[in-house]
């Protein structure tokens, strides 16, 4: 039995649980998902039993090997997978555990502007990047467009201070998870500050 193997998959995609064995006479191989039987294989008996019928079309064994390929992944396929190789030649079964994380492909992140202060011609505000559908394990990075890849700020919230008369700079937020990344529409501090100031003036009027 080896250490737990961590695997990553994307919704709609496929993942292969790697498994090798040098056992000559394998009596059965049993795969379970969160303690529920998933597949039982009898290499000598010639049968493969997929416990739940809906999983039949999702289960495959690449190149006729022991590894299990699971396709059409869903979010709720995330969890613990366990395989046991049973053989009369083994005193106890050979086992392997896997942890699968299934992630969604990220949609375009949304940028919101926090409360703004405008003192002495300097507009100070927070820009917050977020996913509308509350996707998990998302990392956010801010980039200043045209400044090369190394000009960035890590984190969902970016504090900006834009002084009137300064050259405007396009900013974009990148959201990423283990299977995808996505960019927000570029935002311009000058435009955000000017729009906010206009809104404030119209409210006072």
């Amino acid at each position: 039995s080896g250490p737990v193997k961590e695997l990553v998959g994307s919704v709609g995609g496929a993942v292969t649980f790697p498994l090798k064995s040098k056992v000559k006479q394998v009596d059965s191989i049993v795969w379970t998902f969160n303690t529920t039987p998933l597949v039982t294989i009898q290499p000598e008996g010639g049968t493969i039993i997929v416990t739940q019928n809906r999983n039949r079309e999702r289960v495959d064994f690449p190149d006729g090997g022991y590894s299990l390929k699971l396709s059409k992944l869903k979010k709720n396929d995330s969890g613990i997978y366990y395989v046991g190789i049973y053989s009369s030649s083994l005193q106890q079964p050979s086992t392997q555990e896997y942890v699968l994380h299934v992630y969604e492909h990220l949609s375009k992140p949304k940028v919101t502007m926090g409360l703004q202060s405008n003192k002495n011609g300097t507009c100070v505000t927070n820009l917050t990047c977020c996913m509308e559908h509350g996707e998990e394990d998302v990392i956010y990075t801010w980039k200043a467009l045209g400044q090369g890849d190394n000009q960035f700020h890590d984190g969902a919230t970016l504090s900006i201070a834009w002084r009137s008369g300064e050259k405007d700079q396009a900013l974009t937020c990148m959201a990423r998870n283990p299977v995808s990344n996505s960019f927000s529409t570029p935002v311009f501090p000058q435009k955000l500050c000017e729009d906010a100031a206009t809104d404030l003036t119209s409210l006072r009027g």
């Epitope: 064995s21 040098k22 000559k24 294989i41 290499p43 000598e44 008996g45 010639g46 049968t47 493969i48 039949r56 064994f61 190149d63 006729g64 090997g65 022991y66």
Partner: antibody, heavy 120, light 108 residues
């Protein structure tokens, strides 16, 4: 990639013996069963037997007992089948074929076949 | 030994047609049936194992089904390159493994 290369065609006299070879590459030869299958001209397929090169264990079709002897050499990654006391009914194409791991009775890679002709 | 019977020695079909080849086992073999394709002058090629599992790289127009004693192999939309002999084989439990007599698929 997996390849099974068989020895060339054989023309042998009745009563003689012949040994044909199957050289494997591209996979763990010792840990996969190797099968031998007979096909007479214009006929179907007949399973002769299989050998596990790791320890030389064999399983055979009773019909070929005393006719076919299966051996394997791990160091040269080759499987062999010797056919003895040949008669005209032994004239056929003989294939070696690797068993899949997941289903030992299903054969996924086949050699190109060795033609054996028994004629005086 | 288990006898595998393919009732049709020949089947004639047209490109684009759906064709079903049947195979009957003389006793219960659960789902332990494989299907092979053999083109003229070539070695057999594994298409299906354990009744319904498509081998890697096999086009999805080829499907297999059945359990017990009755098995079917279907080509959903026949292509010209599918001209071949198709064999069923039982790989149930202890050998000997046995093959059906083969069904030759001919294109009209």
């Amino acid at each position: 990639q997996v390849q099974l290369q068989q020895s060339g065609p054989e023309l042998v006299k009745p009563g003689a013996s012949v040994k044909i070879s199957c050289k494997a590459s591209g996979y763990a030869f010792s840990n996969s069963w190797m099968n031998w299958v007979k096909q007479r001209p214009g006929q179907g397929l007949e399973w002769i037997g299989r050998i596990y090169p790791g320890d030389g264990d064999t399983k055979s079709n009773g019909k070929f007992k005393g006719k076919a002897t299966l051996t394997a050499d791990k160091s040269s990654r080759a499987a062999y089948m010797q056919l003895s006391s040949l008669t005209s009914v032994d004239s056929a194409v003989y294939f070696c074929a690797r068993s899949t791991m997941i289903m030992t009775g299903a054969m996924d890679y086949w050699g190109q076949g060795t033609s054996v002709t028994v004629s005086s | 030994d288990i006898v595998m019977t393919q009732s049709h020695k020949f089947m004639s079909t047209s490109v684009g047609d759906r064709v079903i080849i049947t195979c009957k086992a003389s006793q219960d073999v659960s789902t332990a049936v494989a299907w092979y394709q053999q083109k003229p002058g070539q070695s057999p090629k594994l298409l299906i194992y354990s009744a319904s599992f498509r081998y890697t790289g096999v086009p999805d127009r080829f499907t297999g089904s059945g359990s017990g004693t009755d098995f079917t192999f279907t080509v959903s939309s026949v292509q010209a390159e599918d001209l071949a002999v198709y064999y069923c084989q039982q790989h149930y439990s202890t050998p000997p493994y046995t093959f059906g007599g083969g069904t030759k698929l001919e294109i009209k």
